[in-house]
């Protein structure tokens, strides 16, 4: 049988990108990070 036409099978999962800045104390400046899907990646 021929195949019914479908897409590639790879699904795109939309995730929220959250940029954040956190003050860590008077002399240490700030941490700037990027969180993707709940995981800090930068």
């Amino acid at each position: 049988d021929a195949e019914f036409r479908h897409d590639s099978g790879y699904e795109v999962h939309h995730q929220k990108l959250v940029f954040f800045a956190e003050d860590v104390g008077s002399n240490k400046g700030a941490i700037i990070g990027l969180m993707v899907g709940g995981v800090v990646i930068a």
């Epitope: 049988d1 021929a2 195949e3 019914f4 036409r5 479908h6 897409d7 590639s8 099978g9 699904e11």
Partner: antibody
Framework: QVTLKESGPGILQSSQTLSLTCSFS??????????VSWIRQPSGKGLEWLAH???????LYNPSLKSRLTISKDASRNQVFLKITSVDTADSATYYC??????????????WGQGTSVTVSS | DVLMTQTPLSLPVSLGDQASISCRSS???????????LEWYLQKSGQSPKLLIY???NRFSGVPDRFSGSGSGTDFTLKISRVEAEDLGIYYC?????????FGGGTKLEIK
């Protein structure tokens, strides 16, 4: 919301051509991956897939009926059509039009029309 | 064509019972893209069929979590954990991987 509605002649004679129309709303047949199938169900029996048309005009047919079927669309009017030539009493059934979009997580026949009943008299 | 065989033909249950319906395909329905397009539909009396489960085990929007699908290759199962009155009707499995898409013969879920 997504709705589909089938219309047809109700009753016709053997050897005539059956023409069915599916009018839909809530989606567009110009959207990538979108498609509409025709499925029929004789009274008290199971479901038989007939044909499918995609957004890009590619069409698929049930091989056992292919020589008698023609599916087409008018995307600007949100309509899909099915023609069945040389009908016989075995073509008496409720005919459904059904949406299926292939470029999506829910790749299945997610919305069905209410069906239109067709009786072929000999 | 891919033959879809459903068992049982009729399934008498008491409300609150678990129900299990089997669907077997005559050949593998794994698509070349890696997905298995096995779906379950419920047709209540006088109504059109409605989608319950797609791609073997995914519940469609609004479908209660008492419905679950499982299986692989050629052997698939629909389970209803606690049958309610609104679940009565005819259940159809369907494969959408090959042309033509084909349906099982149906399983009628009815009150014992």
């Amino acid at each position: 919301q997504v709705t589909l509605k089938e219309s047809g002649p109700g009753i016709l004679q053997s050897s005539q051509t059956l023409s069915l129309t599916c009018s839909f709303s809530g989606f567009s047949l110009t959207t990538s991956g979108m498609g509409v199938s025709w499925i029929r169900q004789p009274s008290g029996k199971g479901l038989e897939w007939l044909a499918h048309i995609y957004w890009d005009d590619v069409s698929l047919y049930n091989p056992s009926l292919k020589s008698r079927l023609t599916i087409s669309k008018d995307a600007s009017r949100n309509q899909v059509f099915l023609k069945i030539t040389s009908v016989d009493t075995a073509d008496s059934a409720t005919y459904y039009c059904v949406r299926r979009r292939i470029i999506t997580v829910v790749d299945a026949m997610d919305y069905w029309g209410q069906g239109t009943s067709v009786t072929v008299s000999s | 064509d891919v033959l879809m065989t459903q068992t049982p033909l009729s399934l008498p249950v008491s409300l609150g019972d678990q129900a299990s319906i089997s669907c077997r395909s005559s050949q593998s329905i794994v698509h070349s893209n890696g997905n298995t397009y096995l779906e379950w539909y419920l047709q209540k009396s006088g109504q059109s069929p409605k989608l319950l489960i797609y791609k073997v085990s995914n519940r469609f929007s609004g479908v209660p979590d008492r419905f679950s699908g499982s299986g692989s290759g050629t052997d698939f199962t629909l389970k209803i954990s606690r049958v309610e009155a609104e679940d009565l009707g005819i259940y159809y499995c369907c494969q959408g991987s090959r042309v033509p898409p084909t349906f099982g013969g149906g399983t009628k879920l009815e009150i014992k």
